[in-house]
């Protein structure tokens, strides 16, 4: 995993825009792990970053991700009166100028370098789940979540009519 110490230096100053150009409501620097306590790590390979899901060795430092929270109106057409309410959306940045992106065509999760304003592919609807977990749903593809597949992050379609191992899309956030 690459050194992540630069995150602390830019947590406040850098993150000052959202979907609509306003500031995030709050930010949170945290390590990201799966429901089964595997760590999400980021490595620089051939001038691009790769994302891994792996068991860390004892005392190995966890990579940190800056989560920037935004409030957003629910995009659903189910009601035009706002009764679906506001949601929380999030962007995830493990190092300066890089953000997690949903690649819906490849069903993959990638780290992209980009400038503000961030594209919609960098925004995820944050779901508050039980067991101190969260899930990340693609803003650009409702019903598709960040999940774990073959020791990598991938996009997983969640259909409420199907049985799905929910653990695949559950993540833990920790300050340590």
């Amino acid at each position: 995993a690459f050194g992540i110490s630069g995150v602390q230096k830019y947590t406040r100053a850098l993150h000052d825009s959202s979907i609509t150009g306003i500031s995030p409501i709050t930010e949170y620097l945290a390590s990201l792990s799966t429901y089964n306590d595997q760590s999400i790590t980021f490595a620089l390979e051939d001038e691009s970053y790769e994302i891994y899901v792996e068991d860390l060795k004892k005392d190995e430092k966890k990579d940190k991700v800056l989560l920037s929270y935004y409030e957003s109106q629910h995009p659903s057409n189910e009601s035009g009166d706002g009764v679906d309410g506001k949601m929380l959306m999030v962007t995830l940045s493990p190092t300066k100028d890089f953000w997690l992106h949903a690649n819906n065509k490849e069903h993959s999760v990638e780290l992209h370098k980009c400038e503000k304003p961030l594209p919609d592919q960098a925004f995820f609807v944050l779901h508050n789940m039980h067991s101190n977990c969260v899930s990340f749903e693609c803003k650009t593809d409702p019903g598709v979540f960040i999940g774990v597949k073959d020791n990598h992050l991938a996009l997983i379609k969640v259909d409420s009519s199907e049985n799905l191992c929910t653990e695949n899309i559950l993540f833990k956030l920790s300050e340590t």
Epitope: L67, Y69, E78, S79, V83, G85, M87, N128, S160, T166
Partner: antibody, heavy 121, light 111 residues
Framework: EVQLVESGGGLVQPGGSLRLSCAAS????????MNWVRQAPGKGLEWMAE??????????HYAESVKGRFTISRDNSKNTVYLQMNSLRAEDTAVYYC????????????WGQGTLVTVSS | DIVMTQSPDSLAVSLGERATINCRAS??????????LNWYQQKPGQPPKLLIF???SQGSGVPDRFSGSGSGTDFTLTISSLQAEDVAVYYC?????????FGQGTKVEIK
């Protein structure tokens, strides 16, 4: 129009049972966590029970005061959530509200009008 | 269980004046870098209505005169300029841990 309509309330004797129903309309019911919240006459709000979605294995959670006596369930084909109440006590007398959590499960943002349950001999 | 305590129990404020309601949790309701604290308004004979979620974000369609602040264990709901239609009981609620618990309520009246 997004709507929750409760039914099944009424007068019941201590130790008796009652099943409350809540019919949902105007939204995709299967996408939302559902709750029951009650309010005793002249008192405050008390959260009772919650049921999640199919991909959460329809997990359920209860307030300690009703655990083992009340059961929440849902039928997505009927857009309905239920509260089965057994071994009812006088202190269960309240208006029972059916409530829907918002998309993402951060807060309750749709409420029914409530149905009154009176437990008395 | 997390115990939520509101103060005062009741409050009489003149029209156009500021109303402030406090809510204290028996332990921190912070998680994921946010405060899991919601505020609801309930008018007589009606179900509650969401005003504020995650301590300071306004619910949809909520007038700008309602604002929330705080983190950890101490929170405040402020009505910047009380209107006649704001007469109601106001509840804080924590949604960090099950069971989700409400404060006992604060009744706001016109002075």
């Amino acid at each position: 129009e997004v709507q929750l309509v409760e039914s099944g309330g009424g007068l019941v004797q201590p130790g008796g049972s009652l099943r409350l129903s809540c019919a949902a309309s105007g939204f995709t019911f299967s996408n939302y966590w559902m709750n029951w919240v009650r309010q005793a006459p002249g008192k405050g709000l008390e959260w009772m029970a919650e049921i999640t979605l199919k991909f959460n294995d329809y997990s359920t959670h209860y307030a300690e005061s009703v655990k083992g006596r009340f059961t929440i369930s849902r039928d997505n084909s009927k857009n309905t959530v239920y509260l089965q109440m057994n071994s009812l006590r006088a202190e269960d007398t309240a208006v029972y509200y059916c409530a829907r959590r918002n998309y993402g499960n951060w807060y309750i943002n749709v409420w029914g009008q409530g149905t009154l349950v009176t437990v008395s001999s | 269980d997390i115990v939520m305590t509101q103060s005062p129990d009741s409050l009489a404020v003149s029209l156009g004046e500021r109303a402030t309601i406090n809510c204290r949790a028996s332990e921190s309701v912070d998680k994921f870098g946010m405060s899991f604290l919601n505020w609801y308004q309930q008018k007589p004979g009606q179900p509650p209505k969401l005003l504020i979620f995650v301590a300071s974000s306004q619910g949809s369609g909520v007038p700008d005169r309602f604002s929330g602040s705080g983190s950890g264990t101490d929170f405040t709901l402020t009505i910047s300029s009380l209107q006649a239609e704001d007469v109601a009981v106001y509840y804080c609620q924590q949604s960090k841990d099950i069971p989700y618990t409400f404060g006992q309520g604060t009744k706001v009246e016109i002075k």
